[in-house]
Amino acid sequence: SITGISPITESLASLSTYNDQSITFALEDESYEIYVEDLKKDKKKDKVLLSYYESQHPSSESGDGVDGKMLMVTLSPTKDFWLQANNKEHSVELHKCEKPLPDQAFFVLHNRSFNCVSFECKTDPGVFIGVKDNHLALIKVDYSENLGSENILFKLSE
């Protein structure tokens, strides 16, 4: 369960890949599209509101082997829209929704080497937001391998 209904903290940051490509959001035909692209020098990076929540549960209840606290995050690039995992389509989408947010909008935050982070689906442990063909997608990571694969590493910068 997520401790409390309000985040412990929030921050505005731009999101980029391990290879320094920017994550951008564009309104097209009344819906938002997510792109992974090289930004022109003078173009301003899109900012995302990251809301951080504490999740507290015993491993027996969660089934993910974690027996304590985890840091959950939701990502909102524009008012009332949140990144959500579509596990059926293995895609990451922007949806307009009201609070309380659905579980698909929550991601477990992992700190990684090189000051990178990864985002693991709350609804599907072992599945992370990643980069595939210049788009964000859901990528299954084999826990027997090192989780350092570059396509699931992101950088946050204020």
Epitope: I8, T9, D67, S113, L147
Partner: antibody, heavy 122, light 107 residues
Framework: QVQLVQSGAEVKKPGASVKVSCKAS????????MHWVRQAPGQGLEWMGE????????SYAQKFQGRVTMTRDTSTSTVYMELSSLRSEDTAVYYC???????????????WGRGTLVTVSS | DIQMTQSPSSVSASVGDRVTITCRAS??????LAWYQQKPGKAPKLLIY???SLQSGVPSRFSGSGSGTDFTLTISSLQPEDFATYYC?????????FGGGTKVEIK
């Protein structure tokens, strides 16, 4: 309950190496990174580095790069910190510490070992 | 590396006093700041995380505030067991770095 048990005090000569162990219990070992922090006598706290017990990846403070090696043994839930080419300035208490949150160091370090005193003296 | 500057380095106070310790980061660290208490011969103890969240089991007389680069730890009414050294630590990026410490002594 969750605890970190460290190996005993060591006395080493300059130029030698020391290997300190930290045995974890009471939690899922691979879900939490392990950090090493040292404290010289009468001084403040100094972060040395971190190991991710899941894959074994490490991040070291620049100051210790090339002299420190952090490893782990998942079968015994033990993390090791080896410091080589010891000098008198390395005399300190060495702590292992676990983050408050699984997978993340953002919420601070809430479980600490009791510390291992390493004395470097000729 | 991010430098953490703590002040004052020591403070003399009496039981019941309000004590404030400040910590300044050389660059923005979002809200990722922790405060620790350390007593002689003991390991540090986490008091506050994410700038203002109280660690479980820590008395409510301890509070944290601030964001960006400037943070504060306040002890609203000092108790005998609070005489110790306090450290701030940025948890935003590697290498994690600590402030130099503030020793709270009996007046």
């Amino acid at each position: 309950q969750v605890q970190l048990v460290q190996s005993g005090a060591e006395v080493k000569k300059p130029g030698a190496s020391v290997k300190v162990s930290c045995k974890a219990s009471g939690y899922t070992f691979i879900s939490y990174g392990m950090h090493w922090v040292r404290q010289a006598p009468g001084q403040g706290l100094e972060w040395m580095g971190e190991i991710n017990p899941h894959g074994g990846s490490t991040s070291y403070a620049q100051k210790f790069q090339g002299r420190v090696t952090m490893t782990r043994d998942t079968s015994t839930s033990t993390v090791y910190m080896e410091l080589s080419s010891l000098r008198s300035e390395d005399t300190a208490v060495y702590y292992c510490a676990r983050p408050s949150a699984a997978y993340s160091h953002y919420l601070g370090l809430d479980i600490w070992g009791r510390g291992t005193l390493v004395t470097v003296s000729s | 590396d991010i430098q953490m500057t703590q002040s004052p380095s020591s403070v003399s106070a009496s039981v019941g006093d309000r004590v404030t310790i400040t910590c300044r980061a050389s660059q923005g660290i979002s809200p990722w700041l922790a405060w620790y208490q350390q007593k002689p011969g003991k390991a540090p103890k986490l008091l506050i995380y994410a700038g203002s969240s109280l660690q479980s089991g820590v008395p409510s007389r301890f509070s944290g505030s601030g964001s960006g680069t400037d943070f504060t730890l306040t002890i609203s009414s000092l108790q005998p067991e609070d005489f110790a050294t306090y450290y701030c630590q940025q948890a935003n990026v590697f290498p994690l770095t600590f402030g130099g410490g503030t020793k709270v002594e009996i007046k």
